[in-house]
Each structure stands twice: as C-alpha cells, then as structure tokens.
C-alpha cells in the first residue's frame, strides 16, 4: 500500500483525482479555498456536520496567500499552535476565531504570522511517525469566546473513547466538495491492534486510529487539526487511506500523549 498524507502540497488545486490510486494512503492537508476545483483529490471531513459556532475556539487555519487553506492547526498556548509536521511551509498565515472557509471578515477572527515553526526532530518526510510541529505566533492571542487554547492530554487514548475531529477539509472523496463552514465529526478510538491490522507495518506508538463503521472520516485539508477527547487535545489529523472513509480503513492521528514533554520543553525554550 503506498502512503499518502493528508495535506496537499499541490496548492494550485488542479491535482486530478485519478492521479492517486484507490487504496493508497494520503496525507490529509489540502489546497482548499476560493479557487478549489471539484477534481482536486485532497482535503476533507466525510459525513460530519457543521460545528456549532464558538465550540472549537482552538481551531486554527493555516493559509497560503491569498486565502488558501492548506492545513488545520490547534491553539495550545496563548502564542503557540500545534499542527502536523507534514504541513510545514516557510510562508503562511494563521487564522483563528473564524467559522467559515471563505475569507469573508468575521468579527471574532484574529490573524497572525508564524514567526517560528519547529517540527518534531523525529519526523521524516514523507513518513508519518512523529507527525507534529509547533508554530510560534508573532504575538499572543486575545482570549475571547472564539479564540482560546486547549490543553494537550497527557493520557493516552483507550479503545472506544469518543472524540471529536474538526476541519475545513473536503466533505466528499474521491471527488471534492469543500464545506462552507467548519465541520465536526464524532469518532471513536480504535484498538492499536485494529489499527495495525488496517495498516500493516505502518503504525507505531506515535499514532492512533479512530473512525466508525458508518463511513465517517477526516481527510486531506483536515491535516494538523484537532482530535478532542474528554475536553482535551488527544491527537492531530495526520494520514489515512484514499479515498477517505473506506470500510476498515480508519483515519490515523498523531498520538499527542507521547509528546507532552517535548511540547512543554520546546515552548519553554523558545518563549
């Protein structure tokens, strides 16, 4: 099985859907935005629903200019985001407190520059292990009902735990349909054995699988976005099968409980 992550670096958004073979794995980032075309094979939460407004105040969008969303991210500190390492770009902008995908101004939004991006040193492109990165913002956020950090869980997830994943990734696969507003999806953590059975020789303890049997899944464009379980940040959208939401092919997420020490130490060393 060839691997494919859920960020799409083909930001021209004209990547034909037939260039990624069915049954391959894909990074879940994307070139989503005003000019996203319906034949782009990247980015989505499948079979989710519109998030309630103000319920995901830690959700961030990483934007290429002019306003093209390519990955999600999570506010974990007043001046720091977490996202997937495979979402790293040298020039990007950060949007917080925004509900719709379109760049239309929203009163709760706050815009930032990333002044430093620090991938986990154990990440290896184009692999999936240690798929996380810290981004330092150019200033501290102004805490509001729309913009607020979330704590990273130090407890590893157990099978059956109910979680919420969110993002602006495409809502269909393999065809593409980008949502108007932030999508939310309830998923359940799977056992590590089920995860390894789904993706033999591709899973390690820096990852966990989650999904359900009803064809619900995250997908490209959602990369780097949050998986929240019991009120704390448990994972980041990382990779999965293509097309998304295939039976017995769950989404794969960065297992943040393994990285709490690195996250804390890196923020402290660079603050």
């Amino acid at each position: 099985v060839t691997e494919h992550v859920l960020a799409n670096n083909d930001v021209s958004c004209d990547h034909p859907s037939n260039t990624v073979p069915s049954g391959s794995n894909q990074d879940l980032g994307a070139g989503a935005g005003e000019d996203a075309r319906s034949d782009d094979s990247s980015s989505r939460i499948i079979n989710g629903s519109d998030c309630d407004m103000h319920t995901q105040p830690w959700q961030a969008a990483l934007l290429l200019r002019p306003n093209q969303l390519y990955c999600g991210a999570v506010l974990v500190h007043p001046q720091w985001l977490l996202t997937a390492a495979h979402c790293r770009k040298k020039v990007f902008r950060v949007r917080l407190g925004h509900y719709s995908l379109s760049p239309v101004y929203e009163s709760g939004q706050q815009m930032f520059q990333g002044v430093k991006s620090i991938p986990h040193p154990g990440y290896s492109h184009p692999g999936h292990s240690n798929d996380l990165m810290l981004i330092k913002l150019n200033r501290r956020i102004r805490p509001t009902k729309d913009v607020r950090p979330i704590n990273v869980s130090s407890h590893c997830p157990s099978a059956g735990t109910k979680c919420l994943v969110s993002g602006w990734g495409t809502t269909k696969s393999p065809q593409v349909h980008f949502p108007k507003v932030l999508q939310c999806l309830n998923i359940s953590v799977l056992s590590q054995k089920r995860c390894e059975d789904a993706y033999p020789r591709q899973i390690d303890d820096t990852m966990f699988c989650a999904g359900d049997k009803a064809g619900r899944d995250s997908c490209q464009g959602d990369s780097g976005g949050p998986v929240v379980c019991n009120g704390s940040l448990q994972g980041l959208v990382s990779w999965g099968d293509y097309p998304c939401a295939r039976p017995n092919r769950p989404g794969v997420y960065t297992n943040l409980c393994k990285f709490t020490k690195w996250i804390q130490e890196t923020i402290q060393a660079n603050s």
């Epitope: 670096n9 200019r65 390492a85 790293r88 040298k90 991938p119 986990h120 154990g122 290896s124």
Partner: antibody
C-alpha cells in the same frame, strides 16, 4: 519570467557599509521568503539571512548587529546592508527565493563586492 | 548550534560512475535538507529539497535520501555536465545559526 538581479557598488572601503539591492520580477514577493547568501572567493556558501513577506527577519548569528535586510513597500526589491566591513567580507553576494518548502529555487546571478582601500 | 558537515570535501570520478556525497547535521534536522549544484562562476542550482524531493527539471540520476542527522546525495551515473561543487543546506531552524550550508564537495574528473 521569474528573475532576480543583484546590484550595488563593486568596491567598498574597509569600515564602510556594503549596500546591495535585489530586483525581483515575475513573482510576488508577498508569497515568498527571500534569502541572502554570500561566497568568498574560492570558498563555500555562507547564509546571511532570510526575510519573510511579513517583514520577519532571521539573521545568521555572525551577522546580527552588522546586517540589515529589508524589502520596499511595493515589494519589488530586497535590500542588504552590511556595516563595518573588512577584507573578510569580500565575496560574491546572491539573493535567492525560497520555494516555500525550504529550498532556494531561484537565484540571482550574484554580484562581486570587494572590500579594499 | 546546528552545524552541517559534508564529506568528502572533494572526489575524483569518471563518467558513468555512481557517486555518493554525504551530509551530516550536528543535531536532527528531520527531513529539512536541500542539495545544490554549483559550477564555476555560476549561481547554485537547487537539485533536491525535503531530503528526497527532486526539484523541477533535475535529471532523475540525482537522488537524495536520509533523515535526522545523516543524508546522502547520489548521482547514479555521472555525466560530463555533473562535474561541479555540491552543497547541502539545512532548513530545520534559523535560530542561532552560523551557517545553514555544508562546506561543499567538489566532484572532479578522474
């Protein structure tokens, strides 16, 4: 056509200030980070610093306090100033564009600056 | 501080040879490594970025591998136009860096 063109005085006196500009054409500076790199005669490449569209600037540790990198408001050129120059600053100076994946994909032809009295 | 060390500093090879150049980082730089080719009197040219991604227009005889601290540039079958100096550059961090580039490897005709 995507192009970078460095220009500036070829000769600078010791203790003076080296000033170079890099004219950018064929792409918007607002989408890319730009780097300055130099190469002393017969030696390897030395990174000087990067400037981002947001005007965030990273400098090599040896360059802090001596180097100023800037870009004009119309975003069509990038500038480099190096103060208190010595003979050791004699080099070919290049500007280059980052491809947004941490590779310098477009380079100027370079301009030789000699520090001598 | 992150330091990049290239080896060998020079090598002699013949057309058709397989050539390998290594670059070692003093600390892990994950996969943020680029390789450049420079010919005398010319600006460097990007060959590979993200350790293994071939830049546009670069022949497939060039390949890059490695992650963490150890990286390799391989030319599978050396061509006459490949005699040049090759540099690696880390893109992991710009904080407290003296130089992002390695010292270079000159590939000469045997």
């Amino acid at each position: 056509e995507v192009q970078l063109q460095e220009s500036g005085p070829g000769l600078v006196k010791p203790s003076g200030t080296l000033s170079l500009t890099c004219a950018v054409s064929g792409f918007p500076l607002s989408n890319y980070a730009m780097s300055w790199v130099r190469q002393p005669p017969g030696k390897g490449l030395e990174w000087i610093g990067d400037i981002y569209p947001s005007d965030i600037i990273d400098y090599a540790s040896w360059a802090k306090g001596r180097v100023t990198i800037s870009q004009d408001s119309s975003k069509t050129q990038v500038s480099l100033k190096l103060s208190s120059v010595t003979a050791a600053d004699t080099a070919v100076y290049y500007c280059a564009r980052d491809n947004n994946d941490y590779g310098l994909d477009i380079w100027g032809q370079g301009t030789l600056v000699t520090v001598s009295s | 501080a992150y330091q990049m060390t290239q080896s060998p500093s020079s090598l002699s090879a013949s057309v058709g040879d397989r050539v390998t150049i290594t670059c070692q980082a003093s600390q892990s730089i994950s996969s943020w490594l680029a390789w450049y080719q420079q010919k005398p009197g010319k600006a460097p040219k990007l060959l590979i970025y993200l350790a293994s991604t071939l830049a546009s227009g670069v022949p497939s005889r060039f390949s890059g591998s490695g992650s963490g601290t150890d990286f390799t540039l391989t030319i599978s079958s050396l061509q006459p136009e490949d005699f040049a100096t090759y540099y690696c550059q880390q893109g992991y961090t710009n904080s407290n860096i003296i130089n992002t580039f390695g010292g270079g490897t000159k590939v000469e005709i045997k």
